[in-house]
Interface confidence: medium
């Protein structure tokens, strides 16, 4: 038994049989191929409050601090995935590492990544039903980066 | 004919046939899934240079501005990755958005992106021979940010 | 075994400030990505989200209450606090405090039973 | 601001009907949450990830939708699912939980 991807899964179910509906082997294997954050998540270097550290990972010691949540979804792939989060509204000082600077913004990096969640094949039903791959774009934040605010025209 | 994921290629080959080694179409269907750069690429807009705008896409409105460059593999998937390249060693000035400060370094993000790679099967010859994906790790640069440097204990 | 369970005044007066404090057990608010939010809904109405905490202390706030509002928490003593200053008859609500999943990317996995504030001159 | 649009707002149906409560959100969201809860009580986590039913939720209940329109679907109504259903997302930037005016669900 091996993973089959669909684009559209609905229409053109390639599938995979699975037993009374629990994941395969191959399902389990792949999916678990969780994308882990850029930065190593640290304990001793999390982001506390709005403030720029001179040590540690790379989204605490940024002006604009970030810290990573975790979304886990055990039907898809990946199953984890990790959002950032921004720590201030504003960029913080590079002189001082804790006062904001009203000049700039930080804000979140989003981009749409592909990901492939499990569905039941369409029309399939029972205790040997199958399930089949659907590509969907997910939109996540990446990481959080100190802007020039827009000037509107 | 469907697109089989296999863990470990080489030693459990989970393949399908192609014609003539073209790749078969769900494969062109599937890997053409490329990954667009988070921000679109303006031609407008492309930061190009060390500064930072007040208008425009956030690479190029960033104090750390950068560039996104194309990374094209047609037996990858995605076959299209983008690398954001630092266009300055140090933060723009968010006052004049030209100078830059040495208080601050201009450093990419980097990602150990999941991706997988179209292989010919273990043992597998001749015209008809059979294919695979194998899975990998592949080291993107995701963006840059405007960092404190770091301080040696 | 997680609870949460929340404490106020009950009745207040108008222009007062409103202090509730949400207890609870069966988890640790210094965990990675552990958050509590307070939520409220008036009588016979929906639900409204107000604030939400973080283990790393980050704050936010809905913006239509953020000049009035403010989180905190005691992370040694399990406990989460919300403060609403110049309360009037719009702020008559039951308030819930509610924990989102380390890994249940924006939902609220346990809710505490409900505090019921009526403010009355 | 994201909102979110519940159908109807108070429905009924008779026992083993099946029935179907839609969520539509004015931007578009990576996932729906929803959420029952009947009088004086508080919510309960009842569909989270679109699709996945939280614990102790009968294998009747289904969530489903992507984008802008979502819906939660009851297979065969029995009396015990009579309540107020809630859907509700979440933005990162700006930073909002958002919750739908909620669908009243009563037996017929």
């Known amino acids: 038994v091996s993973l089959r991807i669909q684009e559209g899964c609905s229409h053109l179910p390639s599938c995979c049989p699975s037993k009374e509906q629990e994941p395969p082997e191959e399902w389990l294997k792949w999916s678990s191929a969780s994308v882990s954050p850029p930065e190593p998540l640290s304990h001793t270097h999390h982001a506390e409050s709005c403030r720029a550290s001179k040590d540690g990972p790379l989204n605490s010691r940024a002006i604009s601090p970030w810290s990573y949540e975790l979304d886990r979804d055990l039907n898809r792939v990946p199953q984890d995935l990790y959002h950032a989060r921004c720590l201030c509204p504003h960029c913080v000082s590079l002189q001082t590492g804790s006062h904001m600077d009203p000049l700039g913004n930080s804000v979140p990096l989003y981009h749409n990544q592909t990901v492939f969640y499990r569905r039941p094949c369409h029309g399939e039903e029972g205790t040997h039903r199958r399930y089949c791959l659907e590509r969907r774009l997910y939109r996540v934040s990446l990481a959080c980066v100190c802007v020039r605010p827009r000037v509107m025209a | 004919v469907s697109l089989r994921i296999q863990e470990g290629c080489s030693h459990l080959p989970s393949c399908c046939p192609s014609k003539e080694q073209e790749p078969p179409e769900e494969w062109l269907k599937w890997s053409s899934a490329s990954v667009s750069p988070p921000e679109p690429l303006s031609h407008t807009h492309h930061a190009e240079s060390c500064r930072a705008s007040k208008d425009g896409p956030l690479n190029s409105r960033a104090i750390s501005p950068w560039s996104y460059e194309l990374d094209r593999d047609l037996n990858r998937v995605p076959q299209d990755l983008y690398h954001a390249r630092c266009l300055c060693p140090h933060c723009v000035s968010l006052q004049t958005g030209s100078h830059m400060d040495p208080l601050g370094n201009s450093v990419p993000l980097y990602h150990n992106q999941t991706v997988f790679y179209r292989r010919p099967c273990h043992g597998e010859e001749g015209t008809h021979r059979r294919y695979c994906l194998e899975r990998r790790l592949y080291r993107v640069s995701l963006a840059c940010v405007c960092v404190r440097p770091r301080v040696m204990a | 075994q997680v609870t949460l369970k929340e404490s106020g005044p009950g009745i207040l007066q108008p222009s007062q400030t409103l202090s509730l404090t949400c207890s609870f057990s069966?988890?640790?608010?210094?965990?990675?990505?552990?958050?509590v939010s307070w939520i409220r809904q008036p009588s016979g109405k929906g639900l409204e989200w107000l604030a939400h905490?973080?283990?790393?202390?980050?704050?936010f706030y809905n913006p239509s209450l953020k000049s009035r509002v403010t989180i905190s928490k005691d992370t040694s003593r399990n406990q989460v606090f919300l403060r609403i200053t110049s309360v009037d008859t719009a702020d008559i609500a039951t308030y819930y405090c509610a924990r989102r999943g380390y890994d249940n990317y924006g939902g609220f996995v346990d809710w505490g039973q409900g505090t019921l504030v009526t403010v009355s001159s | 601001e994201n909102v979110l649009i519940q159908s109807p707002a108070i429905m009924s149906a008779s026992l083993g009907e099946k029935v179907t409560m839609s969520c539509r959100a004015s931007s578009s969201v990576n996932y729906m949450y929803w959420y029952q809860q009947k009088s004086d009580a508080p919510p309960k986590l009842w569909i989270y990830y679109t699709s996945n039913l939280a614990p102790g939720v009968p294998g009747r209940f289904s969530g489903s939708g992507s984008g802008n329109s979502y819906s939660l679907t009851i297979s065969s109504m029995e009396g015990e699912d009579a309540a107020t259903y809630y859907c509700?997302?979440?933005?990162?930037?700006?930073?909002?939980?958002?919750f739908g005016g909620g669908t009243k669900l009563e037996i017929k």
């Open positions: 509700q997302q979440f933005t990162s930037y700006p930073y909002m939980y958002t």
């Open positions: 069966g988890f640790s608010l210094s965990t990675s990505g552990m958050g």
């Open positions: 905490i973080y283990w790393d202390d980050a704050k």
